[in-house]
């Protein structure tokens, strides 16, 4: 299996409740305006063939694909959680900067895009249906990164 | 298939310990979150604790935070739930649960039979 | 005390459908992300019926269906059968990193 290196997040920047509650809440008003709740980005079929010791390098592709392509464009709306919610995410992708795999990451490209795809497909609410998971991407990078 | 297995429940006095295990097979261990889930007799469910697939966070409902230690051992394919400091409504049957796909540990799509736990004098 | 509240009880004849509800005590169970709905008949541990709102695990019959409204998650079983009898618990993962449970709904087949 690849081995992937730097691919850590210090515990401490899990254990801020004031910012834990600011990205649930965020997530919570854009849920509330995705009426499409068949479609889940982030669950089995992101995850499926990728080994825990992998999880955090696909969980980064994820938050940078969010903060670049989804979060700054929509940064005007859902605030006033979306401007403290934002700097955080990124202050966690700058630190997730220098995690990589060695090896063939084929699999993790493949189910990244996957997700990519469908949040292009159903333009404007893809991007709602993403900001409304990031309590899904805190999650997921809180287990997999510590 | 999946198979979980408790054992270490027992009686016990008011402020005493006891450690739970939870023997694993079946699956990959240490591609999932692991939990203990309880319920008193006649009652309802009640989560424990959890704890993520490489044992780096370890969360604790309010109920038992101090006093219960969850932990793992991934080469023995083994959960444990050290609790301290009993007391009388700690009293249910422990089970030990697993996430229901690797990353959804807070979906418990596997359950073991559970280990009963008595608090009393 | 439950921090997620369902009806203690419901009934529906063979063939019905019943709804059971599940209300956060407060909002700040974010937007019910995580919401899971699991069957429990006496004596037995519990199964997981429905995951991520909606989806159901394989086996679970298409009978049981889940959706959520606001703060509000819900399950539906339709063309109720004897074998449907047992309770019903919902849950959701918090802001707070823990898993909370409703109190539990029996369903009673009348």
């Known amino acids: 299996a690849p081995i992937s290196s730097h691919c850590r997040l210090d515990k401490s920047n899990f254990q801020q409740p004031y910012i834990t509650n600011r990205t649930f809440m965020l997530a919570k008003e854009a849920s509330l305006a995705d009426n499409n709740t068949d479609v889940r980005l982030i669950g089995e079929k992101l995850f499926h063939g990728v080994s825990m010791s992998e999880r955090c390098y696909l969980m980064k592709q994820v938050l940078n694909f969010t903060l670049e392509e989804v979060l700054f464009p929509q940064s005007d709306r859902f605030q006033p959680y979306m401007q403290e919610v934002v700097p955080f995410l990124a202050r966690l992708s700058n630190r997730l900067s220098t995690c990589h795999i060695e090896g063939d990451d084929l699999h993790i490209q493949r189910n990244v895009q996957k997700l990519k795809d469908t949040v292009k497909k159903l333009g404007e609410s893809g991007e709602i249906k993403a900001i409304g998971e990031l309590d899904l991407l805190f999650m997921s990078l809180r287990n997999a990164c510590i | 298939e999946v198979q979980l297995v408790e054992s270490g429940g027992g009686v016990v006095r008011p402020g005493g310990s006891l450690r739970l295990s939870c023997a694993a097979s079946?699956?990959?261990?240490?591609?999932?979150?692991m939990n203990w889930v309880r319920q008193a007799p006649g009652k309802g469910l009640e989560w424990v604790s959890g704890?993520?697939?490489?044992?780096?966070?370890?969360d604790y409902a309010a109920s038992v935070k101090g006093r219960f230690t969850i932990s793992r051992d991934n080469a023995k394919n083994s959960l444990y739930l050290q609790m301290n400091s009993l007391r009388a409504e700690d009293t249910a049957l422990y089970h030990c649960?697993?996430?229901?796909?690797?990353?959804?540990?807070?979906?418990?799509?596997?359950w073991g039979r559970g280990t009963l736990v008595t608090v009393s004098s | 005390q439950a921090a997620l509240t369902q009806p203690a009880s419901v009934s529906g004849s063979p063939g019905q459908s019943i709804t059971i509800s599940c209300t956060g005590a407060?909002?700040?169970?974010?937007?019910?992300?995580?919401v899971s709905w699991y069957q429990q008949h006496p004596g037995k541990a519990p199964k997981l019926i429905i995951y991520?709102?909606?989806k159901r695990p394989s086996g679970v019959s298409n009978r049981f269906s889940g959706s959520k409204s606001g703060n509000t998650a819900s399950l539906t079983i339709s063309g109720l059968q004897a074998e449907d009898e047992a309770d019903y618990y919902c849950?959701?993962?918090?802001?707070?990193?823990?898993?909370?449970f409703g109190g539990g709904t029996k369903l009673t087949v009348l």
């Open positions: 649960a697993r996430g229901w796909y690797s990353g959804s540990f807070y979906y418990f799509g596997y």
């Open positions: 079946g699956f990959t261990f240490d591609d999932y979150g």
């Open positions: 704890v993520n697939w490489n044992g780096g966070t370890r």
């Open positions: 407060s909002g700040d169970v974010g937007a019910y992300n995580f």
């Open positions: 991520d709102v909606n």
């Open positions: 849950s959701s993962y918090t802001s707070t990193f823990s898993v909370v």
